[in-house]
């Protein structure tokens, strides 16, 4: 498959294969290799509770426990992302694993992560057209955190 | 700059831009678009000591604080990644902010992220030798979560 | 060639539940970046995207909805099946299966539509 | 959730003529569809991923646009394209497709 760097794609180089009607298959290949979660998706009851696990996953153990919501792009590499959700607005107590503590709060991390999406390259026109990667920062939560809450000077 | 797939790098179709002897501008460009950890990095005392700030970014708020460390590839995209570093083996208490709570353990959140490497395409040789891109997974540390001790069986 | 066709009970009686079938040729819904989805029209009114279902199993619904929504798959015997409980006559319309991707979110193929009457 | 408003609502044009429609998201959209409808048939993908061309339709049909903005045209216009024309797009998080309201083509 025939390609070129393509600077008309947000100023950003990129790949144009060639194709008929559809992307090639390779495109449908390099995409389509699945990312995992960090943790393992649980669809147990706890981890979709504010409560805090003594097995399982990271997520669904943890004080500040989260679940993760799937964000699927066929344009895009990595096709499936993965997002955080806190399942606490505060965290959960250590010794009982189930009590919110007011002393902390349950907060998402957020992460600008790279990202290619697939785009058809500017000043093609027809059947023939190629198509650019472009690369791009999307924000993900990565994590549900526990911290203390910020003092206002 | 003319490219093409290569099937060669690991099964993984890939865009090998022609070059003499270095990488052409394109890869540099589009490799070197610096990405951030996903809080600012805080080169204050307090971000890499064992304690819960009230103040700063997330990492050093977090009752399982941790530093960034860079992870800086010229070959690969994006270049720069950072790993988390757990600054406490277990959670600080949301109290003191200080003392450690052995309820706790403070532990890193393992990611595999989707990453490109730069390659020589099989087969090539000479001066005029093409690169291939590289589709890989990549083991990064995002976050420390402060989680329950697993309860064994 | 890619077709679709949707089947169902024509008419039932408010609070039942509806079921649907969309049987389909021509692809394989375990194909990679595979979906199939389920849309609804109104008489004379717009389309309205209920739910899809993707080759691994993944179910993605409408949230206005979701509550009420059950989309399956049998790969095997190539059908996708839809339930939506409790039904009103808000939900009378035609109801469309058509195929998401391999490769982007436009929907390429459609059903010729199921028309679905609640009537007490 | 993005609302895609189209516009106009009902348009007329002679054979011949050049047809352009609009479709405006209330937020910035990757990619627009767009999908004609006749009388009692079901919905034919146009176009995908804004300007593609989907299998099958005429090179008369052409899709723009990039942001909050998009629009469909039909370089000459001929009496089988009188139709009913939707705009769609997805969002990935949280996942919903959604359609505008329609545009009514007829034939002068």
């Known amino acids: 498959v025939s390609l070129r760097i393509q600077e008309g794609c947000s100023h950003l180089p990129s790949c144009c294969p060639s194709k008929e009607q559809e992307p090639p298959e390779e495109w449908l290949k390099w995409s389509s290799a699945s990312v995992s979660p960090p943790e393992p998706l649980s669809h147990t009851h706890h981890a979709e509770s504010c409560r805090a696990s003594k097995d399982g996953p990271l997520n669904s153990r943890a004080i500040s426990p989260w679940s993760y919501e799937l964000d699927r792009d066929l344009n895009r590499v990595p096709q499936d992302l993965y997002h955080a959700r806190c399942l606490c607005p505060h965290c959960v107590s250590l010794q009982t694993g189930s009590h919110m503590d007011p002393l902390g709060n349950s907060v998402p991390l957020y992460h600008n992560q790279t990202v290619f999406y697939r785009r058809p390259c500017h000043g093609e026109e027809g059947t023939h057209r190629r198509y650019c990667l472009e690369r791009r920062l999307y924000r993900v939560s990565l994590a549900c955190v526990c911290v203390r809450p910020r003092v206002m000077a | 700059v003319s490219l093409r797939i290569q099937e060669g790098c690991s099964h993984l179709p890939s865009c090998c831009p022609s070059k003499e002897q270095e990488p052409p501008e394109e890869w540099l460009k589009w490799s070197s678009a610096s990405v951030s950890p996903p809080e600012p990095l805080s080169h204050t005392h307090h971000a890499e000591s064992c304690r819960a700030s009230k103040d700063g970014p997330l990492n050093s708020r977090a009752i399982s604080p941790w530093s960034y460390e860079l992870d800086r590839d010229l070959n690969r995209v994006p270049q720069d990644l950072y790993h988390a570093r757990c600054l406490c083996p277990h959670c600080v208490s949301l109290q003191t902010g200080s003392h450690m709570d052995p309820l706790g353990n403070s532990v890193p959140l393992y990611h595999n992220q989707t990453v490109f490497y730069r390659r020589p395409c099989h087969g090539e040789e000479g001066t005029h030798r093409r690169y291939c891109l590289e589709r890989r997974l990549y083991r990064v540390s995002l976050a420390c979560v402060c989680v329950r001790p697993r309860v064994m069986a | 060639q890619v077709t679709l066709k949707e089947s169902g009970p024509g008419i039932l009686q408010p609070s039942q539940t509806l079921s649907l079938t969309c049987s389909f040729s021509?692809?394989?819904?375990?194909?990679?970046?595979?979906?199939v989805g389920w849309i609804r029209q109104p008489s004379g009114k717009g389309l309205e995207w209920l739910a899809h279902i993707w080759w691994d199993d993944v179910k993605q619904y409408n949230p206005a909805l979701q509550s009420r929504l059950t989309i399956s798959k049998d790969t095997s015997s190539s059908q996708v099946f839809l339930k939506i409980a409790s039904v009103d006559i808000a939900d009378i319309a035609t109801y469309y299966c058509?195929?998401?991707?391999?490769?982007?979110?436009?929907?390429?193929?459609w059903g010729q539509g199921a028309l679905v009457t609640v009537s007490s | 959730q993005i609302v895609l408003t189209q516009s106009p609502a009902i348009m007329s044009a002679f054979p011949g003529e050049k047809v352009t429609m609009s479709c405006s998201a209330s937020s910035s959209v990757n990619y627009m569809y767009w999908h004609q409808q006749k009388p009692g048939s079901s919905p034919r993908l146009l176009i995908y991923d804004t300007s593609n061309l989907a299998s099958g339709v005429p090179v008369r049909f052409s899709g723009s646009g990039s942001g909050t903005s998009y629009s469909l045209t039909i370089s000459r216009m001929e009496a089988e394209d009188a139709a009913t024309y939707y705009c769609q797009q997805w969002t990935s998080y949280p996942p919903m497709y959604t359609f505008g309201g329609g545009t009514k083509l007829e034939i002068k």
């Open positions: 021509g692809f394989s819904l375990s194909t990679s970046g595979m979906g």
């Open positions: 058509a195929r998401i991707g391999p490769v982007h979110h436009g929907f390429p193929y």
